[in-house]
């Protein structure tokens, strides 16, 4: 996932909405002039702005990166909300790129949680339950079973 | 992992400002597009959304509590407090403190919460 | 302001039901709707946002559904630990305003 926080605003084109500041503050979806006359409204699917501010320019949409999906698109008064695809991950540590899910677990362990869009499937020993590493096994070592769906 | 965790006395006398104190732990308060609300939930009962503040200090208060709610931050500190003046015992509550998603979804983070009571 | 009902008030269920709570929003909210578990003496969690948006680290139980005024919280497989209270905050409009609550206990 890519954004820039701020989205400097062009002049306002004719068809950008002005209203006028409540106390100092302009509405969700809009941003306040450099004046603090007027409010002007974020351009949708470009920018967007989420409270009631004082901001002198809208925040930046996010833009879904490739191997995402885009569940809530950017509105002006939201962000986009983007999840990996299905099948694939994203770690904590790793936030940077969906990763693919395992198929199946090493011999002698079970699946004991399925792929989600934030983890990888999850493997324990039958035996101690102790769970595995998350090192992906070699193809001839694994028990397949199809990846969980992400949740929507 | 970021976390808030609220500070301030637990009893405060009717008449008198109620105040708290939000420390913030593992981010910056400055971090672009976050804004840091206040909630509070009476005993045995809902939430209640009281306010938000920004970083560069502007504030949006509920305006069923508008008259009697300040709001305000140390970025230096990295913290955000509320003050409830002229308070009742029906302001008696656990206050939380809790960030907004930078995208505009809700809290995504919350403080542990701490019980006031209002009490002579 | 906003009303929001949140429905039932409680229910007592076993481990391995699938539970479902229910959030009516006065006016419509688009998907301005998320889903928070409550638990004696821990801090308050998201479990789901814009409306149907699993929470980094929720388990694959808790799903969310709905648009409008109609919002559904769903565990599919209820655990020993998702006993708690649960709410739902509309952020469609200022002021927010959250359900009344669902607890969920033990059968």
């Known amino acids: 996932i890519t954004q820039q926080d701020l989205a400097p605003q062009q002049r306002a084109a004719p068809q950008q909405k002005r209203s006028s500041p409540s106390e100092g503050l302009c509405p969700p979806g809009h941003h306040i002039s450099e004046d603090g006359r007027d409010c002007i409204s974020c351009k949708y699917g470009q920018d967007y702005s989420t409270h009631w501010n004082d901001l002198l320019f809208c925040l930046r949409c996010t833009r879904c990166d490739s191997g995402e999906v885009e569940l809530s698109p950017c509105t002006t008064t939201r962000n986009t909300v983007c999840q990996c695809e299905e099948g694939t991950f994203r770690e904590e540590d790793s936030p940077e790129m969906c990763r693919k899910c395992r198929t199946g677990c090493p011999r002698g362990m079970v699946k004991v949680g399925d792929c989600t869009p934030w983890s990888d499937i999850e493997c324990v020993h039958k035996e101690s339950g102790t769970k595995h590493s998350g090192e992906a096994p070699a193809v001839e070592e694994t028990v397949t079973s199809s990846p969980g769906t992400p949740a929507s | 992992q970021v976390q808030l965790q609220e500070s301030g006395p637990g009893l405060v006398k009717p008449s008198q400002t109620l105040s708290l104190t939000c420390t913030v732990s593992?981010?910056?308060?400055?971090?672009?597009?976050?804004?840091w609300s206040w909630i509070r939930q009476h005993p045995g009962k809902g939430l209640e959304w009281i306010g938000y503040?920004?970083?560069?200090?502007?504030?949006y208060y509920n305006p069923s509590l508008k008259s009697r709610v300040t709001i305000s931050v140390d970025t230096s500190k990295n913290q955000f407090s509320l003050k409830l003046s002229s308070v009742t015992a029906a302001d008696t509550a656990v206050y939380y403190c809790?960030?907004?998603?930078?995208?505009?979804?809700?809290?995504?983070?919350w403080g542990q919460g701490i019980l006031v009571t209002v009490s002579s | 302001d906003i009303q929001m009902t949140q429905s039932p008030s409680s229910l007592s269920a076993s481990v391995g039901d699938r539970v479902t709570i229910t959030c009516r929003a006065s006016q419509g909210l688009r998907n301005d709707l998320g889903w928070f578990q409550q638990k004696p003496g821990k801090v308050t969690k998201r479990l789901i946002y814009a409306a149907s948006s699993l929470q980094r680290g929720v388990p694959s139980r808790f799903s969310g559904s709905g648009s409008g005024t109609e919002f559904t919280l769903t565990i599919s497989s209820l655990q020993p630990e998702d006993f708690a209270t649960y709410y739902c905050?509309?952020?469609?409009?200022?002021?927010?305003?959250f359900g009344q609550g669902t607890k969920v206990e033990i059968k």
């Open positions: 503040i920004y970083y560069s200090g502007s504030t």
């Open positions: 593992g981010g910056s308060i400055s971090s672009g597009g976050h804004y």
């Open positions: 905050l509309q952020h469609y409009s200022f002021p927010w305003t």
């Open positions: 809790a960030r907004d998603d930078s995208s505009g979804w809700g809290f995504d983070y």
